[in-house]
Amino acid sequence: VPRWRQQWSGPGTTKRFPETVLARCVKYTEIHPEMRHVDCQSVWDAFKGAFISKHPCNITEEDYQPLMKLGTQTVPCNKILLWSRIKDLAHQFTQVQRDMFTLEDTLLGYLADDLTWCGEFNTSKINYQSCPDWRKDCSNNPVSVFWKTVSRRFAEAACDVVHVMLNGSRSKIFDKNSTFGSVEVHNLQPEKVQTLEAWVIHGGREDSRDLCQDPTIKELESIISKRNIQFSCKNIYRPDKFLQCVKNPEDSSCTSEI
């Protein structure tokens, strides 16, 4: 008799999930020699232990503590780039500006980026059919709790000037319900962080509006100011030129506004 299996609303675990996590770990430690102390098999065991045999709607930050411990690494606290709804450009930026870090440039973020995973209560199986959706099923699912945990710790580590890249093409440029809006903003430490600088990325070629005046940006400014952190905002009118100028800052066209 086939065992009844809970059907969730979200996509199932990414195929070859264990192999992918292990391979990414090995690759990361090869690229980043300062992470040579990491035992990737132990990392996978800790990752697996966070969600295997547990109800996928009942995952806690505590479940991820062993993994958090193994994934510990030094990140320059004044070189942190947060992002919301504009991951690709943020990652392109840190690939060029190598001394800055997004969460996905750290081991834990790199391991989990773009992956989905969940298990089943009381069985050691990984569920490749479906996983809980944050909205339709439950928020305490393995993927959401993982990102909440690492995002909180990443934001806590930040100091001096923290940058955040925001998508100016979205109706809510700053979204209180995003990971940035619901987790990272509230875990910046005012005793360490002097300024949050938002970079609003424009989508349209002819878009010359000052998106720093957008009501949602004003809302972000209000939240940040109430936390005794200064706020500044810059429009990035030409993201392609912006990246080009990060690569070649001496270029004569890079002195004008981008």
Epitope: D39, M68, K69, T72
Partner: nanobody, 116 residues
Framework: QVQLQESGGGLVQAGGSLTLSCAAS????????MGWYRQAPGKQREWVAT???????GYADSVKGRFAISRDNAKNTVYLQMHSLKPEDTAVYYC??????????WGQGTQVTVSS
Amino acid sequence: QVQLQESGGGLVQAGGSLTLSCAASRNTDSIEIMGWYRQAPGKQREWVATINTGGNTGYADSVKGRFAISRDNAKNTVYLQMHSLKPEDTAVYYCTAVIRTYSTYWGQGTQVTVSS
């Protein structure tokens, strides 16, 4: 907060040895990684060695086989034993401690000078 105090730096002849110590102001059980970085004059700070709570270690290629990192949790201290020192090891050596996955604390640094 974690305060770190390095000691043991000094002037040594090429081929000689030194042991650096770094005392932490809190129980090192709660410190997930302890390590050493160094900065030579006019150069960027570079990673030297790390040790995690499980005792796993990692070393930069430039020091592998010559340097050894260890930690004594009872004394809240991490050590860096440096052997076969070379003039290019001359730098300020900084101790680091990482808690809660990413929050990194730095010591003030101790000068190591290797004369030829």
